[in-house]
């Protein structure tokens, strides 16, 4: 912490301006009034403060607003946002998308994924739900940030907003997030025709159950391998060779080059070698011909 000293009269600060870059840390601490700083936050970003000086300014604001900054200050943080920790941000209440845009721009190119995730979370809480305007802002200013939200927060997305989500916005989503988003997407796109539906639902399929994947295999969709490999393991394992062949169409050929990766590897191990041979890929590791498959999990469930 910066030690407290008295401000020399000639150094007294009446407005936030360029002259402050010549102040030492202890002079900034002694001479800058926190309320003045908060009132003139919009000027701070135009002044080339050092990171050390920004630390002092942050300390000032922290003292003035121990319960968290008001949005009027947050909106104008500029590069001071780079000094914020997730713990700081958790105290904020943010409702304005202009504030979100401003801070997302500042964070670009910096390693701030935890801070950005917390900020987005605060915006969703502040606005009450993940509405279309918020989704549009995220996709425009922070591709992939949608996936930084918890499944709980994502559950507040109305199905009507799903159409605004682009495939690249879901690249970093995990299975638990796609589990939440998939049923909403299914609902949002339910009135579309077969091929159009598949193109739209494709990025969300990591959350699809086996029965939906089986249904897709009957529709000539030609699922690409990257999409297939993002399907839930539990959704892939029950599929037959014939179903996978129908599902992937021409892309089934790619199983050979991805046979060491899950879920392809796990699926191969559950198929009869005879059936795998029909794919014309030289895939090995299936259940040898003449072997009997016992599903012990069924017996355990009955006892």
């Amino acid at each position: 912490d910066v030690e407290r000293t008295t401000c020399p009269p000639e150094k007294e600060v009446h407005e936030i301006d360029e002259s402050l870059i010549f102040y030492k840390k202890r002079e900034l601490e002694a001479c800058v009034d926190a309320a003045l700083l908060a009132a003139q936050m919009d000027r701070v970003d135009a002044i080339p403060f050092t990171y050390e000086q920004l630390d002092v300014l942050k300390h000032k604001l922290d003292e003035l607003y121990p319960q968290g900054y008001p949005e009027s200050v947050i909106r104008h943080l500029g590069h001071l946002f780079l000094k914020m920790s997730p713990e700081d941000i958790r105290k904020w209440n943010v409702t304005s998308l202009e504030t979100l845009k401003a801070l997302l721009k500042v964070s670009k190119g910096h390693e701030m994924s935890a801070q950005v995730a917390t900020l987005i979370d605060r915006v969703v809480v502040g606005r009450g739900q993940l509405d279309k305007d918020t989704v549009d802002t995220l996709t425009a200013f922070c591709p992939g940030c949608l996936c930084s939200l918890s499944p709980e927060r994502l559950s507040s997305v109305p199905p009507s907003v799903i159409g605004a989500v682009r495939p690249q916005d879901l690249d970093t989503c995990g299975p638990r997030q796609l589990d939440v988003l998939y049923p909403k997407a299914r609902l949002a796109f339910q009135n579309m025709s077969g091929s159009e539906y598949f193109v739209k639902i494709r990025p969300f399929l990591g959350g699809a159950p086996t029965e939906d994947v089986k249904a897709l295999s009957q529709q000539n969709v030609s699922m690409d391998l990257a999409t297939f490999m993002k399907l839930r393991r539990e959704a892939v394992l029950p599929l037959t060779v014939a179903e996978v062949q129908k599902l992937l169409g021409p892309h089934v050929e790619g199983l050979k080059v991805e046979e060491q990766h899950s879920p392809v590897r796990d699926w191969i191990l559950k198929q009869r070698q005879d059936d795998l041979d029909t794919l014309g890929l030289g895939l090995q590791g299936g259940i040898p011909n003449g072997y009997l498959i016992l599903d012990l999990s069924v017996r355990e469930a009955l006892s």
Partner: antibody
Framework: EVQLVQSGAEVKKPGASVKVSCKAS????????MHWVRQAPGQGLEWMGN????????YYNERFMSRVTMTVDKSTSTVYMELSSLRSEDTAVYYC??????????WGQGTLVTVSS | DIVMTQSPDSLAVSLGERATINCKSS????????????LAWYQQKPGQSPKLLIY???TRESGVPDRFSGSGSGTDFTLTISSLQAEDVAVYYC?????????FGGGTKVEIK
């Protein structure tokens, strides 16, 4: 050594059909898919489709869907590509290419098909 | 369809110098599970069939000289010939095998300056 030997050059009239063959040797024929790619004179490469030699299942580029048929004869390790309703813009060198997984690892020498009235 | 855009269209390089060819796809070619990029590079010498050089964006096909290297991920890829030899005069094509119809770039003609 993997070899793909294609049938000879053909001259066809507009509206006719052409059937190009590709005889494979030097590997287990049913373990690798075959693709067909064409190249118009002085132009780039265009993927036409692929076929599973084990089952005979074939898949086509939608651009050729109604006009192309790919077949296989396992007894002679040969794949065929037939293109119907030929027009002058189908004049091209047609290549068969054996898959290396997804990419095209081995190519035939090409078959020039000329469509002219 | 995925559109593949190659640049430049042609390239004249002195013997022993570096040649760089770029290829851009209209959507990602990265399989985020396996981290494989579904992109291949081919060389076609005058009057010959194409020949595979690189697959998975950066894996050199066996028998291909190590002066050929591929790099890039997602949508932006590069083929580099570190020291151009006379026998490298050819047209070079990138191809995506991420989603059918598999599409090729327009080709880049490499010549000796």
């Amino acid at each position: 050594e993997v070899q793909l030997v294609q049938s000879g050059a053909e001259v066809k009239k507009p509206g006719a059909s052409v059937k190009v063959s590709c005889k494979a040797s030097g590997y287990t024929f049913t373990n690798y898919w075959m693709h067909w790619v064409r190249q118009a004179p002085g132009q780039g490469l265009e993927w036409m489709g692929n076929i599973n030699p084990s089952s005979g299942d074939s898949y086509y580029n939608e651009r050729f869907m109604s006009r192309v048929t790919m077949t296989v004869d396992k007894s002679t390790s040969t794949v065929y590509m037939e293109l119907s309703s030929l027009r002058s813009e189908d004049t091209a060198v047609y290549y068969c290419a054996r898959s290396g997984g997804l990419w095209l690892a081995f190519w035939g020498q090409g078959t020039l098909v000329t469509v002219s009235s | 369809d995925i559109v593949m855009t190659q640049s430049p269209d042609s390239l004249a390089v002195s013997l022993g110098e570096r040649a760089t060819i770029n290829c851009k796809s209209s959507q990602t070619l990265l399989n985020s599970v396996s981290q494989n990029n579904y992109l291949a590079w081919y060389q076609q010498k005058p009057g010959q069939s194409p020949k595979l050089l690189i697959y998975f964006a950066s894996t050199r096909e066996s028998g291909v000289p190590d002066r050929f290297s591929g790099s890039g991920s997602g949508t932006d890829f590069t083929l580099t010939i570190s020291s151009l030899q006379a026998e490298d005069v050819a047209v070079y094509y990138c191809q995506q095998h991420y989603r059918t119809p598999y599409t090729f770039g327009g080709g880049t003609k490499v010549e000796i300056k």
